[in-house]
Interface confidence: low
Amino acid sequence: NLSQDDSQPWTSDETVVAGGTVVLKCQVKDHEDSSLQWSNPAQQTLYFGEKRALRDNRIQLVSSTPHELSISISNVALADEGEYTCSIFTMPVRTAKSLVTVLGIPQKPIITGYKSSLREKETATLNCQSSGSKPAAQLTWRKGDQELHGDQTRIQEDPNGKTFTVSSSVSFQVTREDDGANIVCSVNHESLKGADRSTSQRIEVLYTPTAMIRPEPAHPREGQKLLLHCEGRGNPVPQQYVWVKEGSEPPLKMTQESALIFPFLNKSDSGTYGCTATSNMGSYTAYFTLNVNDPSPVPSSSSTYH
């Protein structure tokens, strides 16, 4: 003899991303010559056996046999969420419930609050916001490959009462190394299935210049031509270069952009030379010790701020 349970239909809960397709499958062992039926959370019949009951082109029959009724709902909306009921009209009527959960996909995050041309050691504060997630998404920050610790993600219900807007802020002190860095806000959510959904903000940092003196050739000898290149870096790039020689009347004349030229080296050129690179952010002086008596000059790894 068949037990009563053999006439009890069974189904399963389903999770679907908004816009996706969900398949609802209901099975029964003993149908007792009765048809299976699917109805929606509003108790509207969707299919009774192979007969369509609701005019909604998104709902299609997948399979209808005496032991199974499977339907698909395409382009699922948040409003489709709820308990779907599979019924078999035996005596008594038996039902099985399928809870359909619809995930809201978070929108691409928006970064606000960036103030252009930050100065070194100033604090940058950026805000990130993403709407449309269900359940609420999480936001994370990074600077290049480095994780930034933003504040806790704030959650606000969207006007539709179903999805959420999440937001987070991050503050950090900028350094010269951050010039040109990308600050990335990423949204993490189960609907994305690991796919990256992020927005980046490139930041510019203004900082005092640095400079380095490079001799050309690297090992000049007496009688040779020597160029001392003053290579300035900074943001903005230094525009003014002034050369001095310790013990001499400043400044020395440049003959080629930022370079100091010695057409014909002699021993009297020996000494320590300073190149001051200046931008509107400040000045920096690099030094170089030239000893023409030796076969090669001895550079001094040197610098000063002003």
Epitope: Y287, S300, S302, S303, T304, Y305
Partner: nanobody
Amino acid sequence: QVQLVQSGGGLVQPGGSLRLSCAASGRTFSNYARGWFRQAPGKEREFVAAIDYSGGSTNYADSAKGRFTISRDNSKNTLYLQMNSLRAEDTAVYYCAAPASRRPSWDADGYDYWGQGTLVTVSS
């Protein structure tokens, strides 16, 4: 002439912290860069950290990055090295140093004046 007098060394357990100080006298301290070096038994003296005259620029050896902090108080003519998360391999004699001109250098050859050295022992 510059005199550099160090203090603050001693014995500390792994994971512990120490703060080294280096007081300068003689010439105006604030005009010049300062550096810390160390020499472990049987090894060469190695660069640890340096700071420029204004305190605006610092440089650290890879072994010190993230654990050590160099700073200076020009009003007190004093240089500091805060050492956190100390390891056994940090055991060494630590020296503060100053160059004869306003030129920060990450090479011991760039320094003309040296402190007397202070022993830091990291051991459980």
